[in-house]
Amino acid sequence: APVRSLNCTLRDSQQKSLVMSGPYELKALHLQGQDMEQQVVFSMSFVQGEESNDKIPVALGLKEKNLYLSCVLKDDKPTLQLESVDPKNYPKKKMEKRFVFNKIEINNKLEFESAQFPNWYISTSQAENMPVFLGGTKGGQDITDFTMQFVSS
């Protein structure tokens, strides 16, 4: 069976939107009006992995682009990147672990924990126009809470 996917945008708990920053990075900033068109639309695929009521494994691809968020070690540190894939083979139900995030719902907010690196989360900073990254702390000054907005296909 084909993998189930939905299109969505994400905003952090400060209401910052996510946009492209160079070819292989995302950044977070406040957008208004026409600028909202800059925000990236994700194709969120529901993939194989450890699942529970509030924890669902997903892959986050960029809609109509052969780019997926992935988690890899760089200089011995878990790092978030946008990785190019062969569009003929992705998305798929059994995604490699580096592409998998545990979507965790808590109090109507979403967290995205790396399946490859437990307790590391997709994070943004309080500051404007700074990169989205993989952070190893929750509840500190880095932001790990997001809301999801559905986008029609």
Partner: antibody, heavy 118, light 107 residues
Amino acid sequence: EVQLLESGGGLVQPGGSLRLSCAASGFTFSKYFMFWVRQAPGKGLEWVSVISPSGGMTRYADSVKGRFTISRDNSKNTLYLQMNSLRAEDTAVYYCARVGYGGNSDYWGQGTLVTVSS
Amino acid sequence: DIQMTQSPSSVSASVGDRLTIICRASQSINRWLAWYQQTPGNAPKLLIHSATSLQSGVPSRFSGSGSGTDFTLTINSLQPEDFATYYCQQADSFPLTFGGGTKVEIK
């Protein structure tokens, strides 16, 4: 008054190491991104590295990637740049700078000179 | 990486002149552009951020304009203390990059 004071520069041989420090005062250091920017003698400005307030996010210029490491100690209000495998082309005045809105450098230190020569 | 090109690289002008410096980005950087002034032996000083916003304490004779790829710094009525080197810097994406600088000399 915002103040940034770099130290640790000096003469080092190619292949050697140096650790720069930047002591910050006059603002809440733990809330700000910080940069290192360098300027070779008689040349323009080159961005070197950035670190987020928590230290969780760092980025480097390609020219220093794998050789330099940026870090910070928020309890000491201090920014660091560990520089390894130094090359002649790393000779420059190194400035630390506070990051302002959207990624500009709104306050700068006076700089510390690093000379890599045999 | 985004390349930033400044022109002219140097210019001679007189006190009271109106001066325009141009900065071009190799791709759109929206409005994420800053301008700095540097005098010999000193650290750079932020003049303009977000392409058009005057940094606190900077005289109003300095102004910035532009968006996308083309930006200008204008100094209305040059003062003796304005003879310096000016740099633009893009903050749209890492690695951050600076223009090569424009040296403003006394004619």
